[in-house]
């Protein structure tokens, strides 16, 4: 790690469309990038009624976005599909939704999906 | 200094097949995503076909499938498009251009691009 | 497929006009958003990925923003340079897709 960050290098990876695609549905994905770049994970997901669908999930690219977050949180407040990124090997293996809210005060929903996304 | 050098274009009757290639340069291959692109004259930009960094994964454009192949040799930094079967609407300048992972895709490396004209 | 519609097809500005053009998608993209620069008889080059983030080299008066369908690129003070055709681009799914161009013209 430079300056105590903590380099991504390899992502978990899942694709919903893995037919379509004709990838793997899940695996670990390196990640690569030039050198003066950093590296992130990510992950993508829909909550359709009350169920998560994980869409996508890899390595992302140099984001200032993603700098320096540990874990991979979902802020917006009720999107349509919801993405996060972080950086750290696999940081993206668990994911969040912690909205930013106004006047309410946020409720922290973790999603830790069931097999068969995490073997 | 990445460098990304297209060749093999040039007319071919409809029907007819060609196989352009895109060598690289200036950056470790092997751990690059590819794609092609092309633009037909006066047109917008249409993505062709991408492939994953170590050839796993390749993905078309529902106009090419079954037409095109995408393939590369990460001993020869090189990268390739084979396009059978050409008809007319296939005229365009192809790139290549540039990946990162899968799923990230955000082309930041491109050729000069070579025209490919299909016409009897 | 992802259909992008940009917005608008041309447009006339003058050096040091602030330029907007804008660009939506058919379904959410979330962050998956780019933005390219051509010029006549060149290869595009990348100026913005992932909605905000400008690539190497890039001036500062180039930014982009947005999130789910709706998206911006914006110049804040054109130069002369910059007179060329825009391209918004998605690689949430395939196949990538981008959008019809922007031409922007000296006014």
């Known amino acids: 790690a430079i300056l105590g960050r903590s380099e991504t290098q390899e992502c978990l990876f899942f694709n919903a469309n893995w037919e379509k695609d004709r990838t793997n549905q899940t695996g670990v994905e390196p990640c690569y990038g030039d050198k003066d770049k950093r590296r992130h994970c990510f992950a993508t997901w829909k909550n359709i009624s009350g169920s998560i669908e994980i869409v996508k999930q890899g390595c992302w690219l140099d984001d200032i976005n993603c700098y320096d977050r540990t874990d991979c949180v979902e802020k917006k407040d009720s999107p349509e599909v919801y993405f996060c990124c972080c950086e750290g090997n696999m940081c993206n293996e668990k994911f969040s939704y912690f909205p930013e809210m106004e006047v309410t005060q946020p409720t922290s929903n973790p999603v830790t999906p069931k097999p068969p996304y995490y073997n | 200094e990445v460098q990304l050098l297209e060749s093999g274009g040039g007319l071919v009757q409809p029907g007819g097949s060609l196989r352009l290639s895109c060598a690289a340069s200036g950056f470790t291959f092997s751990s690059y995503s590819m794609n092609w692109v092309r633009q037909a004259p006066g047109k917008g930009l249409e993505w062709v076909a991408g492939i994953n960094y170590n050839g796993g994964y390749t993905s078309y454009a529902d106009s090419v499938k079954g037409r095109f192949t995408i393939s590369r040799d990460n001993s020869k930094n090189t990268l390739y498009l084979q396009m059978n079967s050409l008809r007319a609407e296939d005229t365009a300048v192809y790139y290549c251009a540039r990946g990162a992972n899968w799923h990230d895709t955000a082309l930041d490396y491109w050729g000069q691009g070579t025209l490919v004209t299909v016409s009897s | 497929d992802i259909q992008m519609t940009q917005s608008p097809s041309s447009l006339s500005a003058s050096v040091g006009d602030r330029v907007t053009i804008t660009c939506r998608a058919s379904?959410?993209?979330?962050?998956?958003l780019n933005w390219y620069q051509q010029k006549p008889g060149k290869a595009p080059k990348l100026l913005i990925y992932?909605?905000?983030s400008r690539a190497s080299g890039v001036p500062s008066r180039f930014s982009g923003s947005g999130s789910g369908t709706d998206f911006t690129l914006t110049i804040s003070s054109l130069q002369p340079e910059d007179f060329a055709t825009y391209y918004c681009q998605q690689s949430y799914d395939s196949p990538l897709t981008f959008g019809g161009g922007t031409k922007v013209e000296i006014k």
């Open positions: 992932a909605v905000t």
């Open positions: 379904q959410s993209i979330v962050s998956y």
